[in-house]
Interface confidence: low
């Protein structure tokens, strides 16, 4: 049976086997097309989600679809039900927390009172002044907290206590990519991880350990990517994996926070990378132990220079490394997080591509997660 399962797939009605290599090849080999059902699926970018959270204390903003203007949510009459609606609009199913925060001196959006209509937040008609003088600070999920803070050094062995959201994404029990837990059901990774194997069956996620071989594997229900854009072949290197059963969070299994929509990181901002990837370019072997390294944001203009990526780094990507080179992600780290710490840890990038590993003028290129928040929320909403 093990051999059969490894090399063949069983079609139903009528029962017959087809070679596994015929799964997800775009051709229907089973009469009801089951061979093309459990495949990496693409999901369009979709409409604008009409709520978002700002880096200014995670304050809630609401879109007026009639004018296209964003407004900050006033705390007046804001309820738990409205908090839940806001989070559901972003695709979260967990219980949110919210509090009042003072309207700051730099408040640049009009502040309006919020109501609900057809499970979407709306601005209250003829909303008067915000009497409380407070905005809504909303957290849809407790995320980005680890048991241990890493020390700032070059490259060193990492502990799962520091990075409880890091997972190993494996095909046929072999580590292929890293990934990050975003919530009990969802793991964030890179789309290019699934280029070779587009059937969902053999993909597994391993969470809760910093050693590659030692943790139980979790079944995957769905793998979702964005539709390919031939104009920008390296863009859209982002994927969401839906787990068959929700994770139980613990000290070593926790989610990382998504970035805020306005998370603009300036050059030299310190960031962290982690992974089990190759320890040497074009050689060495996959690391059995999770490694961590501190890097920094590298200016996109520098990254696109003639001696670097010559314009290949788009607005939906970001560069990180160290100016002198030598610290970088490598093969096998793909899909893992590029992380920024404010109050919590945020996944601001996904390990995507680069020329070589650790070269001074060619740092790592990362998918800019803030550019895909809308897509993530739309996928989650569709799967609620």
């Amino acid at each position: 049976k093990v051999i059969l399962d490894k090399y063949y797939f069983l079609c139903g009605q009528p029962l017959h086997f087809i070679p596994r290599k015929q799964l997800c090849d775009g051709e229907l080999d089973c009469p009801l097309g089951e061979d093309e059902e459990h495949c990496v699926k693409s999901f369009p970018e979709g409409p604008a989600v009409a709520v978002r959270l700002s880096k200014d204390r995670s304050t809630l903003q609401v879109l007026d679809s009639a004018t296209g203007n964003w407004f900050s949510a006033c705390f007046d009459n804001f309820t738990e039900a409205l908090a839940e609606t806001a989070c559901r609009q972003m695709g979260y199913s967990s219980k949110p927390t919210f509090r009042a925060v003072e309207i700051g001196p730099d408040q640049d959006l009009d502040v309006v009172e919020i109501t609900e209509n057809s499970q979407e937040l709306r601005m209250r008609n003829s909303s008067g002044p915000c009497l409380s003088g407070s905005l809504v600070s909303l957290h849809c999920l407790a995320c980005g907290k680890s048991l241990k803070t890493p020390r700032v050094v070059g490259v060193e062995e990492a502990s799962v206590d520091s990075w409880p959201w890091q997972v190993s994404i494996q095909y046929d029990k072999q580590h292929v990519c890293g990934g990050s837990i975003l919530d009990p059901h969802w793991v964030l990774t890179a789309a290019h991880c699934f280029r070779k194997h587009t059937d969902v069956f053999n993909w597994k996620v391993r969470a809760g350990s910093d050693k590659l071989g030692s943790f139980p594997s979790l079944a995957v229900a769905k793998i979702i990517i964005i539709e390919f854009n031939p104009m920008y072949p390296k863009d859209n290197d982002i994927a969401l994996m839906k787990l068959q059963f929700p994770l139980t969070f613990s000290g070593t299994v926790r989610p990382i926070c998504l970035p805020f929509f306005d998370e603009e990181l300036t050059p030299a901002t310190p960031l962290w990378i982690i992974g089990w990837g190759f320890t040497k370019q074009n050689g060495g072997k996959m690391s059995d132990i999770l490694l961590q390294a501190s890097v920094q944001v590298i200016d996109s203009t520098r990254c696109n220079a003639d001696d670097a990526y010559q314009g290949e780094v788009t607005e939906k990507m970001m560069c990180a490394g160290i100016p002198e080179g030598g610290v970088d992600t490598c093969q096998g780290d793909s899909g893992g997080p590029l992380m920024y710490q404010s109050d919590q840890w945020h996944v601001v990038g996904i390990v995507s591509w680069g020329y070589g590993c650790g070269g001074p003028s060619t740092p790592g290129v990362y998918t800019k997660v803030s550019a895909y928040l809308n897509w993530i929320y739309n996928v989650w909403k569709a799967e609620l």
């Epitope: 009605q13 070679p19 290599k21 051709e27 229907l28 080999d29 089973c30 009469p31 009801l32």
Partner: antibody
């Protein structure tokens, strides 16, 4: 995705035979079932039969039994459909299509004209 | 052989219209039904398989439903590129048989 390329148009006399080829690329040839479907001018689609992926076993529609032969040449990744005792009502575009049950890849079609 | 009857045989519609095509099998075929689109001079293109599964790369405005003997293809908002002939096909048993086709024309 599989690409299927068919041979060119043919003009045949009634009573003769025609052999249309369909060359596959972009996948493991031995795993493909190839169906043949024809379409008379201005008419609908008609399934003629299929040749199965391994071993070359065939299944023909009753209507064409005895007149149609489907074969394959694995060395060139090509499938052939031969229709004999042609009559004027066999004038049609003949398509090869990949799949036993539904076909997501089709050849470009081969027009066979039967005329005296 | 299983007979497949499609209706209407032709229809006129405008861009943005919701279009529904029906297909009836002469005996129960469970959900072993496919829908194809064909444009003049071109090979058919698979839209829907297993009655309701959207083929990869086909726009989501196309949807299929039904089981047993009665099936429906719906185009939620007709686009200029959707003017074509649509065929249903049963894959329950050989010989595989097609419906007579529905030509969707511009009003």
């Amino acid at each position: 995705q599989v690409q299927l390329v068919q041979s060119g148009a043919e003009v045949k006399k009634p009573g003769s035979s025609v052999k249309v080829s369909c060359k596959a690329s972009g996948g493991t040839f031995s795993s493909y079932a190839i169906s043949w479907v024809r379409q008379a001018p201005g008419q609908g689609l008609e399934w003629m039969g299929r040749i199965n992926p391994s071993g070359g076993s065939t299944s023909y529609a009753q209507k064409f039994q005895g007149r149609v032969t489907m074969t394959r040449d694995t060395s060139t990744s090509t499938v052939y459909m031969e229709l004999s005792s042609l009559r004027s009502e066999d004038t049609a575009v003949y398509y090869c299509a990949r799949g036993r049950y539904s076909s997501s890849s089709w050849g470009q079609g081969t027009l066979v004209t039967v005329s005296s | 052989d299983i007979q497949m009857t499609q209706s209407p045989s032709s229809l006129s519609a405008s861009v943005g219209d919701r279009v529904t095509i029906t297909c009836r099998a002469s005996q129960s075929i469970s959900t072993y039904l496919n829908w194809y689109q064909q444009k003049p001079g071109k090979a058919p293109k698979l839209l829907i398989y297993a009655a309701s599964s959207l083929q990869r790369g086909v726009p989501s405005r196309f949807s299929g439903s039904g089981s047993g003997t009665d099936f429906t293809l719906t185009i939620s908002s007709l686009q200029p590129e959707d003017f074509a002939t649509y065929y249903c096909q049963q894959s329950y048993t050989t010989p595989l048989t097609f419906g007579g086709g529905t030509k969707v024309e511009i009003k």
